[in-house]
């Protein structure tokens, strides 16, 4: 454990003033694994003045960082870059004169407590005023800053000329694009202090490159992948005070593909499971032994899960018999193309010939996760498939 501190497997605390610490506590090699540390408590450490860029990076599991009644004057911009789990930061009663939002912008903080610090009234801390104004009143802190006359001024009253939130405006064409094509987005930003412009493309798969010059920026996306349909692209303007963003959703149109089609499985009903991708939503058509399959109450397509441009479902059959054995073909079609796949289904042997009523198909259960949704409502009464109801149909509830 670092000198002057105590440790457990998940916690480090350095609270005794004497002799105290002069640097952020670091674990010795071959001691506790720093990744397991979730809380660091530092108090009464008047000679601890700096958190360097690499001081905290080993504590990737850190959730709570408390440094109170100490001498903290400076925190490096990238000090918490690797600490994405940080939720609570308490820097009460230290010697901080300034603190940038750049320290914390990538963190999802529940608490940032900064009372009792001698902040200098400047644009650098205007973001704290903005943060206070957006928080609900029970959470607000009494933050003060020292003005030019070295008088304590409530942060709520802070007025700094030419110090405001930036703005971002995205001039995007219709962002519905065909797979394989390219598109260029333009963005302009403004504000004082002059903001920087950057693009947040998330986990965009398609190749992209950006150009930025002062307050203008462009993002070119080439050979657009269908995997990027539904993704959000944001233009972000950021300055000392805060950030603004303008976003668009990318819609990619592409021909359908049947990515999964398997032999029937039995649960409450028999199910021929399938997965289809396509945008716009493909129309689905089933064929039985080469002829169009007329869907009915007893044989119908059910979509269980829709994941943006991907549809997971079943051709559902009620009590199929040997009469329903055969080749089933699924065709998915939209204006960009079509795809089809076939499987052979064996539900039951012929009576008197084959008494095997439960063939060795894998018993994979297929859950109805959502209300079934029919897509591709196509029936053709002229090519009827034998009904799966071989019992007395008058007993059915219609």
């Amino acid at each position: 454990c670092p000198t002057s501190c105590k440790c457990s497997s998940a916690r480090i605390w350095c609270t005794e003033p004497s002799p105290g610490i002069v640097a952020f506590p670091r674990l010795e090699p071959n001691s506790v694994d720093p990744e397991n540390i979730t809380e660091i408590l530092i108090a009464n450490q008047k000679r601890l003045e700096i958190i360097n860029e690499d001081d905290v990076e080993a504590y990737v599991g850190l959730r709570n960082l408390t440094i109170v009644d100490s001498g903290l004057k400076f925190v490096a911009y990238k000090a918490f870059l690797k600490n994405s789990n940080l939720r609570h930061i308490n820097f009460t009663r230290n010697k901080l004169t300034s603190l940038s939002r750049r320290h914390f912008r990538h963190l999802d903080l529940s608490d940032l407590i900064l009372t009792g610090n001698p902040f200098t009234c400047s644009c650098d801390i205007m973001w704290l005023k903005t943060l206070q104004e957006t928080k609900s009143s029970p959470d607000t802190q009494d933050l003060y800053c020292l003005n030019e006359s070295s008088k304590n001024m409530p942060l709520a009253n802070l007025q700094i000329p030419n110090c405001g939130l930036p703005s971002a405006r995205l001039a995007a064409p219709n962002l519905t694009v065909e797979e394989g094509k390219s598109v260029t987005l333009s963005c302009s930003v403004g504000g004082d202090p002059l903001p920087t412009l950057y693009w947040d493309v998330g986990n965009l798969v398609s190749k992209h490159m950006n150009e930025t010059s002062h307050t203008q920026g462009s993002l070119r996306i080439t050979n657009i992948s269908s995997d990027d349909s539904g993704k959000q692209i944001s233009c972000v303007a950021e300055n000392l005070v805060g950030e603004d963003q303008d976003s668009v959703n990318l819609t990619v149109h592409f021909a359908p593909t049947i990515t999964f089609l398997e032999s029937p499985t039995s649960d409450h009903h028999w199910c021929i499971p399938f997965t289809v991708r396509g945008n716009p939503k493909p129309a689905l058509q089933w064929f039985y032994n080469g002829a169009i399959l007329n869907e009915s109450k007893y044989i119908c397509t059910k979509i269980h899960v829709t994941n943006h441009t991907e549809y997971h479902g079943c051709l559902q059959l009620d009590n199929p018999t040997h009469m329903n054995n055969g080749d089933y073909t699924l065709m998915a079609k939209n204006e960009y193309g079509k795809d089809e796949r076939q499987i052979s289904a064996h539900f039951m042997g012929r009576p008197g010939v084959d008494y095997e009523t439960n063939p060795n198909y894998p018993e994979v259960l297929y859950e109805d996760w959502t209300t079934p949704t029919d897509i591709g409502d196509t029936t053709n009464k002229s090519n009827e498939i034998p009904s799966t109801d071989v019992a007395d149909q008058s007993n059915r509830e219609h």
């Epitope: 609270t15 005794e16 003033p17 004497s18 002799p19 105290g20 002069v22 009464n44």
Partner: antibody, heavy 118, light 108 residues
Framework: QVQLVQSGAEVKKPGESLKISCKGF????????IGWVRQMPGKGLEWMGI????????RYSPSFQGQVTISADKSITTAYLQWSSLKASDTAMYYC???????????WGQGTMVTVSS | QAGLTQPPSVSVSPGQTASITCSGE??????VSWYQQKPGQSPVLVIY???KRPSGVPERFSGSNSGNTATLNISGTQPMDEADYYC???????????FGTGTKLTVL
Amino acid sequence: QVQLVQSGAEVKKPGESLKISCKGFGYSFTNYWIGWVRQMPGKGLEWMGIIYPGDSDTRYSPSFQGQVTISADKSITTAYLQWSSLKASDTAMYYCASHTKDGTWDIWGQGTMVTVSS
Amino acid sequence: QAGLTQPPSVSVSPGQTASITCSGERLGDKYVSWYQQKPGQSPVLVIYQDDKRPSGVPERFSGSNSGNTATLNISGTQPMDEADYYCQAWDSSTSLYVFGTGTKLTVL
């Protein structure tokens, strides 16, 4: 040489005020806490409070809060313990203590005997 | 932390090991220091941070701390070790240090 030198013995009457001192030599007085410890005749040691001369952050033991005032003047590397109205029960030896970067309260003054009697 | 409890007195023959205990709730979570005070003198630090010895303190002084108890051991005790011994720890509830009740060590 690192040392703390305390002011001399005091004999006072109840109700009188008093301020005793503790001057630091040979170390960075501003950057290390100073503490005051009471020892009544024939009794054990009791922490009264501590002060950080660099910013005058002061902590008092609950039993001494409001009874005494601890202060420091970093410009002359001196800490103080004062009473506004002494009582007979304040009769005791008072020690100041500080620490170096490695030790915990490893520097002690020689003590100041305060006698309060009518 | 309500306080630190020490035995009022411990007796030991010269050359033997003297053990003085200090008890307090979750004391192992705090650092413990030990002070020696001879009659008419200021206290002297003999152990800090549970088991560290300041320079000039003989090796026969050692310390340990775990659970609810800290211990000061003096091996090969000498007549010059006869004194009052106080443990000390940080009390986070009051943000101040607290001394133990003190133990008088007698070397028979």
